[in-house]
Interface confidence: low
């Protein structure tokens, strides 16, 4: 379900009625941040609020996937008057607050990026003292993780009538193009299924019928690089098995 809240122009509730934009809740996040897998990325988030000199307890939260309802990946809390936001949650220890919430900055650093981190992230701040107020970015920042191709699986499988087929699955962003090469094949894109449902960065290519013994090579390529892996097919003639 979707947790949703309202105020004005993406705000949550104010405890006072304000019309000056500088006094209203607002949150500034870029639409997108790009970084390569393995590297770190910074998700910027700054905010304004209507409580002129708030120094009470506060909590900074980042969540992934969707606003209000998505799982939290980071949370920290600062005591009254403190500029130290004590981390209470950092998923897999890879999330770290760069900004100072007391200075209206919730910017977050994400370490050791993986393709699975490619999602939308939403920052949120909660005031919990005399003022009870909070605000969350509804549109969030998209973290776009790029990655050179990596072949995650290559295999030969039996198919009907003593035939064999080959499967190659690779991941990467942009999703890589796959090509097979092998005996009597030249270069073939084969039957490419891309991307797999629920696995946005995975691409699979199938060779439906292997007609010759020998080495079959799958090559995955995108703008960041290429990767290849091979599988060998040796049929025992007169038998129904194969060695791969």
């Amino acid at each position: 379900f979707v947790r949703t809240k309202i105020d004005t122009t993406e705000n949550l509730l104010n405890t006072e009625v304000h019309s000056s934009p500088a006094q209203r809740w607002s949150m500034q996040v870029p639409p997108e941040v790009s970084a390569e897998a393995g590297d770190a990325a910074v998700l910027p988030c700054t905010f304004t609020h209507p409580h002129r000199h708030y120094d009470g307890p506060l909590t900074a939260i980042w969540r992934a996937g969707e606003p209000y309802a998505g799982p939290q990946v980071f949370r920290c809390a600062a005591a009254r008057g403190s500029e130290l936001c004590q981390t209470a949650l950092s998923l897999h220890g890879r999330f770290r607050l760069l900004g100072n919430p007391r200075r209206n900055d919730l910017s977050l650093r994400v370490e050791r990026l993986a393709l699975a981190d490619d999602r939308r992230y939403f920052c949120r701040v909660e005031f919990a003292g005399d003022v009870h107020d909070r605000y969350e970015s509804r549109h969030g920042v998209r973290l776009h993780v790029t990655a050179a191709p990596r072949i995650v699986n290559i295999s030969v499988l039996p198919s009907p009538a003593h035939a064999f087929r080959a499967l190659c699955t690779a991941e990467g962003e942009p999703p890589p193009a796959l090509a097979w090469s092998g005996p009597a094949l030249g270069n073939s894109l084969a039957a490419v299924r891309s991307p797999r449902e629920g696995h946005g960065h995975l691409v699979t290519a199938e060779l439906p019928a292997l007609t010759h013994d020998g080495r079959y090579t799958c090559t995955a390529a995108n703008s960041l690089g290429r990767s290849e892996a091979s599988v060998y097919l040796f049929r025992f003639h007169g038998a129904s098995g194969a060695s791969t």
């Epitope: 379900f1 606003p67 549109h139």
Partner: antibody, heavy 123, light 112 residues
Framework: EIQLQQSGAEVKKPGSSVKVSCKAS????????MHWVKQAPGHGLEWIGT????????AYNQKFKGKATLTADRSTSTAYMELSSLTSEDTAVYYC????????????????WGQGTLVTVSS | DIVMTQSPLSLPVTPGEPASISCRST???????????LYWYLQKPGQSPQLLIY???NLASGVPDRFSGSGSGTDFTLKISRVEAEDVGVYYC?????????FGGGTKVEIK
């Protein structure tokens, strides 16, 4: 099905108070802020204020500050509006309405309304 | 406060004919995020208001596509391409750019 069921009509004496209720069903009560709107006889719509049922945080139209008090009871999924120091000017139909959002269509508007509660102030 | 002004006050219509209602705000309702925070509601006789259009031009769920909303930052129009008998009632515009939310005075649509 989302429904907002308001309490029945009230006749009150000048100077007294009235508390109108709005019971929400068909959705998670704390998901959407509850707003209150006034419609005096033969008149248009006037926004009174709003409450976040999750925290009790409120925002009011300055005109209704001190007149209306908004509260919410999460255990019964019910929002309340209390009007104090009633005068004939407070005679009106009062509506509760939830401001609805979806993830794909962020702000959809006052999509769900109660049936209205007529408050008559008369000596 | 943002003042919303509607015209006309009353609109006699013929079924099957088009109709148009105007709404003007004293401040631009176009936010820097690209959204225009103008909403249209219809209150049929004896009923609660119902949402027709959200964010200036988006048709609310279940609303017939003969209704459409358009406009700029301060001038808005609700159009009914072919009025039907069931469309009678009072139409209100509302701004949700900033507190307090404010409604227009309403336009009463009635069959000639």
């Amino acid at each position: 099905e989302i429904q907002l069921q308001q309490s029945g009509a009230e006749v009150k004496k000048p100077g007294s108070s009235v508390k109108v209720s709005c019971k929400a069903s068909g959705y998670t009560f704390t998901d959407y802020d509850m707003h209150w709107v006034k419609q005096a006889p033969g008149h248009g719509l006037e926004w009174i204020g709003t409450i976040d049922p999750e925290t009790g945080g409120t925002a009011y139209n300055q005109k209704f500050k001190g007149k209306a008090t908004l509260t919410a009871d999460r255990s019964t999924s019910t929002a309340y509006m209390e009007l104090s120091s009633l005068t004939s000017e407070d005679t009106a139909v009062y509506y509760c309405t939830s401001f609805y959002y979806t993830y794909s269509n962020y702000d959809v508007g006052f999509a769900y309304w109660g049936q209205g509660t007529l408050v008559t102030v008369s000596s | 406060d943002i003042v919303m002004t509607q015209s006309p006050l009353s609109l006699p219509v013929t079924p099957g004919e088009p109709a148009s209602i105007s709404c003007r705000s004293t401040k631009s309702l176009l936010h820097s995020n690209g959204n225009t925070y103008l909403y249209w509601y219809l209150q049929k006789p004896g009923q609660s208001p119902q949402l027709l259009i959200y964010r200036m031009s988006n048709l609310a769920s279940g609303v017939p596509d003969r209704f459409s909303g358009s406009g700029s930052g301060t001038d808005f129009t609700l159009k009914i391409s072919r009025v039907e008998a069931e469309d009678v009632g009072v139409y209100y515009c509302m701004q949700h750019l900033e507190y307090p939310f404010t409604f227009g005075g309403g336009t009463k649509v009635e069959i000639k």
